[in-house]
């Protein structure tokens, strides 16, 4: 004969555990029903009556089968630098992520605790690694033959144009200026031409540092919580 199906609450066999979606109540010493996601235990079970469940109140939730006496509070409303990517419901917590142009500087178990704006690279520097949801932009000095004349969190170093006759040679923060009317664009080996986003504003080229305040040339600030990479800097 098939074993009789036990209905909760029931006393488990010695050495056995309660079934899926059940829990062992120490006081009643019985296997009792868990409450479904979106509910909590309003009344715990006894030897003769099963768990009584009730729906979570507004702004509270339970995500798992449970026997908690109170639902968990949803996190506070998303701050102005965040967007709500998951709403607070009876079955799930609110999740806030950083808005475009920002990244998560201090994370928490779900979502982000503190967002920060993506830093921008100055003229003479291009984006080495773009910012992500969880990491800041990394800048790199423009190599000889390339330049960036913008303050941007997306612009890479671009090749100088090649002139038939050079009026003003290019540098790290300025393109070459040609005297001829039809310059040809340089395509250095490996150079990639991406569509360049419009800069936020016209930018003065960075002045040459005065020796008394010029930084040393061995430090590239890191992105996120990773160690710094090596690279040269200008002031």
């Amino acid at each position: 004969l098939p074993a009789q199906v036990a209905f909760t609450p029931y006393a488990p066999e010695p050495g056995s555990t309660c079934r899926l979606r059940e829990y062992y109540d120490q006081t009643a010493q019985m296997c009792c029903s868990k409450c479904s996601p979106g509910q909590h235990a309003k009344v715990f079970c006894t030897k003769t009556s099963d768990t009584v469940c009730d729906s979570c109140e507004d702004s509270t939730y339970t995500q798992l089968w449970n026997w908690v006496p109170e639902c968990l509070s949803c996190g506070s409303r998303c701050s102005s630098d965040q967007v709500e990517t998951q709403a607070c419901t009876r079955e799930q917590n609110r999740i806030c992520t950083c808005r475009p142009g920002w990244y998560c500087a201090l994370s928490k178990q779900e979502g982000c605790r503190l967002c920060a704006p993506l830093r921008k690279c100055r003229p003479g520097f291009g984006v080495a690694r773009p910012g992500t949801e969880t990491s800041d932009v990394v800048c790199k000095p423009c190599a000889p033959g390339t330049f960036s004349n913008t303050t941007s969190s997306t612009d890479i170093c671009r090749p100088h144009q090649i002139c038939n006759v050079v009026a003003i040679p290019g540098n790290a923060s300025m393109d070459a200026v040609c005297t001829s009317t039809s310059p040809t664009r340089s395509m250095a080996p490996g150079a990639v031409h991406l569509p360049q986003p419009v800069s936020t504003r016209s930018q003065h080229t960075q002045p040459t540092p005065e020796p008394s305040t010029a930084p040393s040339t061995s430090f590239l600030l890191p992105m996120g919580p990773s160690p710094p990479a090596e690279g040269s800097t200008g002031d």
């Epitope: 201090l106 830093r119 303050t151 936020t200 003065h204 002045p207 600030l221 890191p222 160690p227 800097t233």
Partner: antibody
């Protein structure tokens, strides 16, 4: 010579306003992120805020709503407008230039400082 | 909100001593840390940025180390000119911040 010179400090009554100026010579202020740091008598350094080279402003929590950082590129001058002043705002206020390390438009790390101007808030 | 805590607040030492000052951040700031020196009545002077990179013109007896939440400033052989107050500063984040500087460490003559 590259230097920053603050002015505009003095005695002001609680609830009053004051505007500090920082005049730069030898550098083009518009190319740099510039900030303010203050120091109460006998106390440590306290970050006030800065304006990035791209024009974005960042403030300490306590300064938001009362203090405003701006600049006039044509005058090569940085400003700190302080409103609703309190006794605890009494301090030497320093203007400082961001080092721009790592090629960033701001790092909040200052490698050039002015001599400071004293603001006293008292009745 | 990231807070910076320096220790000790005061340090008595003699010329020639090796001096160590520590700075602790409440959250990981990677290597976004600077050290400044300040003498009475003067503006602060940047010594180290990026936790360990010496600013131009700063004597090599100064060195910095650490990453994440624990940082150290070391003066290998204290000179008469080094008696001053030293501050650490985080440069990692500027949103929701009360102060970016540590409380300071005064290095005085023993």
């Amino acid at each position: 010579e590259v230097q920053l010179v603050e002015s505009g400090g003095g005695l002001v009554q609680p609830g009053g306003s004051l505007r500090l100026s920082c005049a730069a010579s030898g550098i083009d202020l518009s190319s740099y992120t510039m900030g303010w740091v203050r120091q109460a008598p006998g106390k440590g350094l306290e970050w006030v805020g800065f304006i990035s080279s791209s024009g974005h402003t960042y403030y300490a929590n306590w300064a938001k709503g009362r203090f405003t950082i701006s600049r006039d590129n044509s005058k090569n001058t940085l400003y700190l407008q302080m409103n609703s002043l309190r006794a605890e705002d009494t301090a030497v206020y320093y203007c400082a230039r961001d080092g721009g390390y790592g090629g960033y438009d701001y790092t909040g790390i200052f490698n050039l400082w002015g001599q400071g101007t004293l603001v006293t808030v008292s009745s | 909100d990231i807070q910076m805590t320096q220790s000790p607040s005061t340090l008595s030492a003699s010329v020639g001593d090796r001096v160590t000052i520590t700075c602790q951040a409440t959250e990981s700031i990677s290597s976004w840390l600077a050290w400044y020196q300040q003498k009475p009545g003067k503006a602060p002077k940047l010594l180290i940025y990026g936790a360990s990179t010496l600013e131009s013109g700063v004597p090599s007896r100064f060195s910095g180390s650490g990453s994440g939440t624990e940082f150290t400033l070391t003066i290998s052989s204290l000179q008469p000119d080094d008696f001053a107050t030293y501050y650490c500063q985080q440069g990692y984040i500027y949103t929701n911040v009360d102060n970016t500087f540590g409380g300071g460490t005064k290095v005085e003559i023993k």
